[in-house]
Amino acid sequence: ELCDDDPPKITHATFKAVAYKEGTMLNCECKRGFRRIKSGSPYMLCTGNSSHSSWDNQCQCTSSAARNTTKQVTPQPEEQKERKTTEMQSQMQLADQVSLPGHCREPPPWENEATERIYHFVVGQTVYYQCVQGYRALHRGPAESVCKMTHGKTRWTQPQLICTGETEPSQFPGEEEPQASPDGLPESETSR
């Protein structure tokens, strides 16, 4: 049920899951100079019943200075298999995500965790794409990719997204620019 490969790469775009299907694993990775505690689980697992989903296990990191090493903990071979990273971590407001049935929300950060989270996605997971700063989206459909099982093999669907430079026009039919920008956002940024 695990997805065999990474979600598609889109030039000048990053992807993010807004919620994680039950069965998803998150590696307990620690930042440089820290390691997973001896008794600690190597991953967190999204589990649930009919009414509620939550992350089993807690990731915990401890200083590795006592061992006279600053090397980041290396995942076991089975952990390295099917490494998935999500790239828009800081842009999600964890308290305000929609609660999708059968999904776990983004786990809160743990002390001394690594800068990049590594997920092991399962069939049915959706990830969402966003153009990086300085690029705008040309799109006619959802910029989503879903991990699907077809003929016994997993594959990710292709998101309908192209990210183009700021100077190129890319408006939707019917789109209008805001007349004022009370939020202090750059008015020059015309839209997708």
Epitope: V18, S90, Q130, H139, P142, F172, E176, D183, S191
Partner: antibody, heavy 130, light 107 residues
Framework: QVQLVQSGAEVKKPGASVKVSCKAS????????IHWVRQAPGQGLEWLGI????????IYAQKFQGRVTMTRDTSTTTVDMELSSLRSEDTAVYYC???????????????????????WGQGSTVTVSS | EIVLTQSPATLSLSPGERATLSCRAS??????LAWYQQKPGQAPRLLIY???NRATGIPARFSGSGSGTDFTLTISSLEPEDFAVYYC?????????FGQGTKVEIK
């Protein structure tokens, strides 16, 4: 709790304008886009447009282009929909509904949303009659 | 724009019976289809998103299926509170569009 509360019923003459307000509460205003949908008496649902509260960008249905204006005020977490040059066929219940955007940062300017219209206002009745 | 056609226009059934509602798109909408329920004098309520996923708090008797152009909403055993109008809506292309609705009435 999460809710969208709309302004009251309006009676307008043909050619006039109407402004319907939608006050959001109980959630982070910028994280959700607001759709406007209307329903004429005994009819189905018709989409008017969408506004991204971050930056105030809008997309309007072609049918209402030039007649509809959607704005938002982040300080009061209110979204307004104004429809001008009213005619009798604009008589309808007007709804605002939220959808969650993909990205939640303060500079997100696109219109990508997921899930569905999970919270709706109670509706505002607009009657156009001479 | 994508046209969604719902059938039948009206479905007359008794409580406890199974209801099968259809929504057909004029072109593929992948799985980007939602179903809403609307009762008289009320705003619509999200039932199903992305063709087959029940929204939060929706009873298990509601299920959705289909992809591409043909979609089905099934109510396995009608409860008295299920008699209402049901709309499908696509988010695959701009503008978002709704079907014309199917009324499920008591026989």
């Amino acid at each position: 709790q999460v809710q969208l509360v709309q302004s009251g019923a309006e009676v307008k003459k043909p050619g006039a304008s109407v402004k319907v307000s939608c006050k959001a509460s109980g959630y982070t205003f910028n994280s959700y886009y607001i759709h406007w949908v209307r329903q004429a008496p005994g009819q189905g649902l018709e989409w008017l447009g969408i506004i991204n509260p971050t930056g105030g960008r809008t997309i309007y249905a072609q049918k209402f282009q030039g007649r509809v204006t959607m704005t938002r005020d982040t300080s009061t977490t209110t979204v307004d929909m104004e429809l001008s040059s009213l005619r009798s066929e604009d008589t309808a219940v007007y709804y605002c509904a939220r959808v969650p955007g993909y990205c939640k940062d303060t500079s997100c300017q696109d219109f990508y949303y997921y899930y569905g219209m999970d919270v709706w206002g109670q509706g505002s009745t607009v009657t156009v009659s001479s | 724009e994508i046209v969604l056609t719902q059938s039948p226009a009206t479905l007359s059934l008794s409580p406890g019976e199974r209801a099968t509602l259809s929504c057909r798109a004029s072109q593929s909408v992948s799985s980007y289809l939602a179903w809403y329920q609307q009762k008289p004098g009320q705003a619509p309520r999200l039932l199903i998103y992305d063709a087959s996923n029940r929204a939060t708090g929706i009873p298990a008797r509601f299920s959705g299926s289909g992809s591409g152009t043909d979609f089905t909403l099934t109510i396995s055993s009608l409860e008295p509170e299920d008699f209402a109008v049901y709309y499908c809506q696509q988010r695959s292309n701009w503008p978002p569009t709704f079907g014309q609705g199917t009324k499920v009435e008591i026989k």
